[in-house]
């Protein structure tokens, strides 16, 4: 979890509420879900390594236009110490597989709050 | 459906250990960290210690002094709470208790109990 | 450790009153903060979480309220079957720690 210190915030965060905040509003998405999340976009999926925050967001700044998740792009570009622009790709980007945009955060949500759990009993 | 049940009644003598399991089902086990608490006769809610069953991580009430040992074994879905050195204040009725930490929070679903006597 | 300090430690009441119940804690707990109702010889069951989001098939009359170190739990109109204990959890940071309790009596 030491690679959430770069969190974007007036003070200083711990890593694990920079986490939690993060978590919550994947949670809030997944919830208040009414109609396909993001028009049903598709984006790159990726691997839930240790670079992954930089490439959700590579993959997630790909969609323009959803308000459902500007939030999320907001939080994640805090957790990348580079600046990511629309149409970059990492090596962590499984490149010939696109899903949808609801199953990405799902898949993120879970992954994180594994993260979040390790974190919690280390 | 979610459900947590413990093992039975145990009768101990002063410097015995105890162990209390609790086997769950209705969910992933890995999922949801697992909490142990302790409620002495007509006294409040008092948490021991938890774990998460991933990875066997623990964390711990240091009013227990290191006396409290938790484990999770993901082969049978259950999780185990080892109290040693006994006293008689340790008589209670013990508790499990599980939950997702973001939806429910992490003491969701609780095991029915098991009531630990020390006596001599 | 962080302290959640429950007031009043018991209380009567008549069917159909409102119930307030508050907690305290030491420090900013983030809203982090569980309410249980416990009967006698019984399990704990949750009732809140998340200081106001009420467990699926708690009945609306339970509702819970507040931020940063002070938290409420209200019973709008209580129901004979509401007469029992509670208590509320922070679960912001380790060690969690519950409050002392609340014993709600028939007046």
């Known amino acids: 979890l030491t690679c959430l210190g770069g969190f974007a915030s007036p003070g200083p965060v711990p890593p694990s509420t920079a986490l939690r905040e993060l978590i919550e509003e994947l949670v809030n998405i997944t919830q208040n879900q009414k109609a396909p999340l993001c028009n049903g976009s598709m984006v790159w999926s990726i691997n839930l390594t240790a670079g992954m925050y930089c490439a959700a967001l590579e993959s997630l700044i790909n969609v323009s236009g959803c308000s459902a998740i500007e939030k999320t792009q907001r939080m994640l570009s805090g957790f990348c110490p580079h600046k990511v622009s629309a149409g970059q790709f990492s090596s962590l980007h499984v490149r010939d597989t696109k899903i949808e945009v609801a199953q990405f955060v799902k898949d993120l949500l879970l992954h994180l709050k594994k993260l979040f759990r390790e974190g919690q009993f280390n | 459906e979610v459900q947590l049940v413990q093992s039975g009644a145990e009768v101990k003598k002063p410097g015995a250990t105890v162990k209390i399991s609790c086997k769950v089902s209705g969910y992933t086990f890995t999922d949801y960290e697992m909490h142990w608490v302790q409620q002495a006769p007509g006294k409040g809610l008092e948490w021991m210690g938890g774990?998460?069953?991933?990875?066997?991580?623990?964390a711990s009430n240091q009013k227990f002094k290191g006396r409290v040992t938790i484990t999770a074994d993901k082969s049978t879905d259950t999780a185990y709470m080892e109290l040693s050195s006994l006293r008689s204040e340790d008589t209670a009725v013990y508790y499990c208790?599980?939950?997702?930490?973001f939806g429910g929070g992490p003491f969701a679903y609780w095991g029915q109990g098991t009531l630990v006597t020390v006596s001599s | 450790d962080i302290k959640m300090t429950q007031s009043p430690s018991s209380l009567s009441a008549s069917v159909g009153d409102r119930v307030t119940i508050t907690c305290k804690a030491s420090q900013d707990i983030n809203s982090y903060l569980s309410w249980f109702q416990q009967k006698p010889g019984k399990a704990p069951k949750t009732l809140i979480y998340?200081?106001?989001r009420l467990v699926d098939g708690v009945p609306s009359r339970f509702s819970g309220s507040g931020s940063g170190q002070d938290y409420t739990l209200t019973i709008s109109s209580l129901d004979p079957e509401d007469f029992a204990t509670y208590y509320c959890?922070?679960?912001?940071?380790?060690?969690?720690?519950f409050g002392g309790g609340t014993k709600v009596e028939i007046k």
């Open positions: 774990i998460d069953p991933e990875t066997g991580g623990t």
């Open positions: 959890l922070q679960y912001d940071e380790f060690p969690y720690t």
């Open positions: 208790a599980t939950g997702d930490y």
């Open positions: 998340r200081a106001n």
